[in-house]
Amino acid sequence: FERTRSLQDPCSNCPAGTFCDNNRNQICSPCPPNSFSSAGGQRTCDICRQCKGVFRTRKECSSTSNAECDCTPGFHCLGAGCSMCEQDCKQGQELTKKGCKDCCFGTFNDQKRGICRPWTNCSLDGKSVLVNGTKERDVVCGPSPADLSPGASSVTPPAPAREPGHSPQ
C-alpha cells in the first residue's frame, strides 16, 4: 500500500521541513517562518507551539521539529509534552482547588507536586513505628518484637514513593 500510495502521490517525496505547495503546482516549498513539518510528504506545515506565560521555551522550533516547552520556576509540567503547568507546593502540602494546603494528620508528601499519601501502617507488617511520620516524611517502621533476637537488627525503610499524582492503592 505504501509503495502504491507513493507512486500515485506526487507529494510523497517532499522532505521534512518542506510542504507540497498546491499553489505552485505541487513543487516542494520550505515551511514558512514559525512553522514546521517533521515528516516528508506533507501538504501543509504545522504552526510552531509558542511557550508563553507560565510556559517557557525548552527547545526552539525548527523547520523540522516543534518547539518544546517546560514551566517557569514555581510550576511543574503535567500532561503529554507538558501541555499544562501546575503550581508547585511545599513539601508537606498538596494542591487543592483553593491552593496549597498542608497535609492532614496521618498523611505526608515529600515532593513539591502530587497529593498527600497516608503514612505506612507498620502494624500491618507486625512492626512498630521507629520514627514518627510528619507532613513531609513517612513513618519509619522498626523491627517487630520477634525480630529482636540477639545479633538481629533491622530497620524497614519506608515504602518507595508512588508516582506523583497517583492516589494510594
Epitope: P10, N13, C14, C20, Q26, I27, C28, P30
Partner: nanobody
C-alpha cells in the same frame, strides 16, 4: 515566478559530447527534483534523466551510461553531460522542475523553453 533557462545546445558530430545547463530561479532549488526531457522532430516529448534533492538519479534506458545528470545547489543549476552522442539524440532538450521532489514516475510542474541539440556527421 519560476524560471528555467537552458543553455549549451548546438551542433555536434556523432560520438561527440555536449554539456547542457539549466539555470533555475523563483523557487527553492535545493529541495526540489529536476529533470531533463527531449522532443525529436515529429515525436512526443520523452523523459531523459532526473535528479532528486538528495542527488538520487534516474535515467532513461536509451541514455544510460552515456548521459550524466548533476546539480549545483549553490548555483541553482542542473546539468546534463552528454557523451557518445548519436543521430537519434537530436532533439530539443527541456529542463523540468518536477512535482514533489519525485524522480520515480516524475511529473513536471514547470518547463524551460528548451535548447536544440543536433547530432550530424
Amino acid at each position: 515566478e519560476v524560471q528555467l533557462l537552458e543553455s549549451g545546445g548546438g551542433e555536434v558530430q556523432p560520438g561527440g559530447s555536449l554539456r547542457l545547463s539549466c539555470a533555475a530561479s523563483g523557487f527553492s532549488f535545493s529541495i526540489n527534483a529536476m529533470g531533463w526531457y527531449r522532443q525529436a522532430p515529429g515525436k512526443r516529448r520523452e523523459f531523459v534523466a532526473a535528479i532528486e534533492s538528495s542527488r538520487n538519479t534516474v535515467y532513461a534506458e536509451s541514455v544510460k551510461g552515456r548521459f550524466t545528470i548533476s546539480r549545483d545547489n549553490a548555483k541553482n543549476t542542473v546539468y546534463l553531460q552528454m557523451s557518445s552522442l548519436r543521430a537519434e539524440d537530436t532533439a530539443v532538450y527541456y529542463c523540468g522542475l518536477l512535482k514533489g521532489n519525485r524522480v520515480v514516475s516524475p511529473s513536471v510542474a514547470y518547463w524551460g523553453q528548451g535548447t536544440l541539440v543536433t547530432v550530424k556527421p
